[in-house]
């Protein structure tokens, strides 16, 4: 389905709003560093120039790729060796390897200082004054700090965005109406983010075989009653869509997103019955919807699985006839009658039965030699199982930050060379499993938790692969993206790690203690553990936690003093002292 | 795709030989058991022999032990199997197949024990 202008085609299907916007991510996070004011400029340029495309799709320059427009517009930014150094070099390529070279130096840390929100009234005046730029601003400042955020699900977003405003700078009370929304945006929108990024790693790293069985499990998970051959056409057209996305060509993902959305509407009887109300909603929200969808429920009448995939004399003839197309149909067949496993043990169950077919079938008695293939698999079962009865045990007795607590012990002790606010930061979302999975019923807490863990530690991943110091973390990271979570989680104390010299500076503390919110409390004294961990391997849990109780008297102390600073000053040797004689 | 083509059959007396050959291709193989598979007319499927993907390992029926020898040539991605001292109850259609399968994936070569 060619054309002779790619721009024209893209504009005319998505129409100029979301062509727009799409573009602003689109430039956002490749310049991650660059003004708003200049992207704007770079938007509406290529919006003027995608517009005489329409008018006359053979006029100069409209035949190009969207890359080596976008590209080329990218490459006239004044600012771009002094800003970006290295990534200029980008520009001196010719268009595949010029886009490679872009994607390559997205950045998924970049240096920009946290988003501060302003009071209300002065939000809503901006927001009255220009909507259009207010939600561009939006739109810039998500995008830059998420790189590989899904770009059609950000412009969602930012729907809401505007809704929560419209709703609540007319209310009475403009705060408690907008507070609230504005925390749900932000928390959906960076796990919207981290499970955006696991994708992409997922297919950068790993390829589509990869992206392309996970599809397959969870979308027979969500969709039993379809056949396989209707989940492998959603399976093919998905990961065209993430691979476009993740590859930095947002319009062509967005349009066939929209595409996949129109399809599974209008083919919901051999999808599912609960696509019905995602259906009627407009474009951005029922995409949304659909991919939040609920699983059906199982048919009930599915036979065992032994009959076609053990006790089967035609198990090798039909895997060597098809290997992909007969695994498939085995993680098919297996995650439709599993709601209750998460994606990554579905995976890794038919690893597992790929490797025992590849040695028996080589057999002379290949059906001898896998008869017993599903007793191999509740070992790989129970290890999911008693991770989370486990954890949320702990979580129970703990709470969240104690929880938070014990997983930075556990992780820093694992791999203590990790950057301390690497550390701090995935250890505060892994501890975060607790509250999101462990109040579910049985059957959806693996789900829930493994599938959760394993998006937390693409981040770890992610973070360590721009600065590698650990072998152990490169080693969890990239053998095996199904393995990644079992990895970590059989990552024992690091014995070969030197323990940090005590830095006295790292645990003085101000009277600015005092004015921080709960939040940035608990990440200042989790901060202060991953280093006393640094410092001490092997403390035990309870001289950690004795130290820890001090530190949190030594600072309420301090903050209900009359003259704080000099509580500080006074107290904080104190403290550092009876630590390092309590860890000795 | 997975294509086994049988050959070598014909027309022989009691206790005469005869070599089969199977061509395979569309499959990896040296990767993969093969084995002998026979039918009488009217009756079911039979199990001749078995050979695994090296060639190592090799199991026959009782009915052919001693008699026939079961091989393979993985660099020709060829299966063979030798039968000597042929007796009027070998007379079947035989058939190559994958792993342990027992279903007929190709037309198979005509074996007539017959004075």
């Known amino acids: 389905d060619t054309h002779k202008s790619e721009v024209a085609h893209r504009f005319k299907d998505l129409g100029e709003e979301h062509f727009k916007g799409l573009v602003l991510v689109a430039f956002s996070q490749y310049l991650q560093q660059c003004p708003f004011e200049e992207h704007v400029k770079l938007v509406n340029e290529v919006t003027e120039f995608a517009k005489t495309c329409v008018a006359d799709e053979s006029a100069e320059n409209c035949d190009k790729s969207l890359h080596t427009l976008f590209g080329d517009k990218l490459c006239t930014v004044a600012t771009l060796r002094e800003t970006y150094g290295e990534m200029a070099d980008c520009c001196a390529k010719q268009e595949p390897e010029r886009n490679e070279c872009f994607l390559q130096h997205k950045d998924d840390n970049p240096n920009l200082p946290p988003l501060v929100r302003p009071e209300v009234d002065v939000m809503c005046t901006a927001f009255h004054d220009n909507e259009a730029t207010f939600l561009k601003k939006y739109l810039y400042e998500v995008a830059r700090r998420h790189p590989y955020f899904y770009a059609p699900e950000l412009l969602f977003f930012a729907a809401r965005y505007k809704a929560a405003f419209a709703e609540c700078c007319q209310a009475a009370d403009k705060a408690a109406c907008l507070l609230p929304k504005l925390d749900e945006l932000r928390d959906e929108g960076k796990a919207s983010s981290a499970k955006q990024r696991l994708k992409c790693a997922s297919l950068q790293k790993f390829g589509d075989r990869a992206f392309k069985a996970w599809a397959v499990a969870r979308l027979s998970q969500k969709f039993p009653k379809a056949e396989f051959a209707e989940v492998s056409k959603l399976v093919t057209d998905l990961t065209k869509v993430h691979t476009e996305c993740c590859h930095g060509d947002l319009l062509e993902c967005a349009d066939d997103r929209a595409d996949l959305a129109k399809y599974m509407c209008e083919n919901q009887d051999s999808i599912s019955s609960k696509l019905k109300e995602c259906c009627d909603k407009p474009l951005l929200e029922k995409s949304h919807c659909l991919a939040e969808v609920e699983n059906d429920e199982m048919p009930a009448d599915l036979p065992s699985l032994a009959a076609d995939y053990v006790e089967s004399k035609d198990v090798c003839k039909n895997y060597a006839e098809a290997k992909d197309v007969f695994l498939g149909m085995f993680l098919y067949e297996y995650a439709r009658r599993h709601p209750d496993y998460s994606v990554m043990l579905l995976l890794r169950l038919a690893k597992a039965y790929e490797a025992t077919l590849e040695k028996c079938c080589a057999a002379a008695d290949p059906h001898e030699c896998y008869a017993k293939v599903f007793d191999e698999f509740q070992p790989l079962v129970e290890e999911p199982q008693n991770l989370v009865k486990q954890n949320c045990e702990l979580f129970e007795q703990l709470g969240e930050y104690k929880f938070q607590n014990a997983l930075l012990v556990r992780y820093t002790k694992k791999v203590p060379q990790v950057s301390t606010p690497t550390l701090v930061e995935v250890s505060r979302n892994l501890g975060k499993v607790g509250a999101k999975c462990c109040k579910l019923p049985e059957a959806k807490r693996m789900p829930c938790a493994e599938d959760y863990l394993s998006v937390v530690l693409n981040r770890l991943c992610v973070l360590h692969e721009k600065t590698p110091v650990s072998e152990k973390v490169t080693k969890c990271c990239t053998e095996s993206l199904v393995n990644r979570r079992p990895c970590f989680s059989a990552l024992e104390l690091d014995e070969a790690y030197v323990p940090k010299a005590f830095n006295a500076e790292t645990f003085t503390f101000h009277a600015d203690m005092c004015t921080l919110s709960e939040k940035e409390k608990q990440v200042k004294k989790q901060t202060a553990l991953v280093e006393l961990v640094k410092h001490k391997p092997k403390a035990t849990k309870e001289q950690l936690k004795g130290v820890m109780d001090n530190f949190a008297a030594f600072v309420e102390k301090c903050c209900k003093a009359d003259d704080k600073e000099a509580c500080f000053a006074e107290e904080g040797p104190k403290f550092v002292a009876a630590s390092q004689a309590a860890l000795a | 795709q997975v294509q086994l083509v049988e050959s070598g059959g014909g027309l022989v007396q009691p206790g005469g030989s005869l070599r089969l050959s199977c061509a395979a291709s569309?499959?990896?193989?040296?990767?993969?058991?093969m084995s002998w598979v026979r039918q009488a007319p009217g009756k079911g499927p039979e199990w001749v022999s078995a050979?695994?993907?090296?060639?190592?390992?090799?199991r026959y029926a009782e009915s052919v032990k001693g008699r026939f020898t079961i091989s393979r040539d993985n660099a020709k991605k060829t299966l063979y199997l030798q039968m000597n001292s042929l007796k009027p109850e070998d007379t079947a259609v035989y058939y190559c197949?994958?792993?342990?399968?027992?279903?007929?994936g190709s037309q198979g070569t005509q074996v007539t024990v017959s004075s």
């Open positions: 569309g499959f990896t193989f040296g990767s993969f058991g």
């Open positions: 050979i695994d993907g090296g060639g190592a390992d090799t």
């Open positions: 197949t994958i792993g342990g399968s027992t279903s007929r």
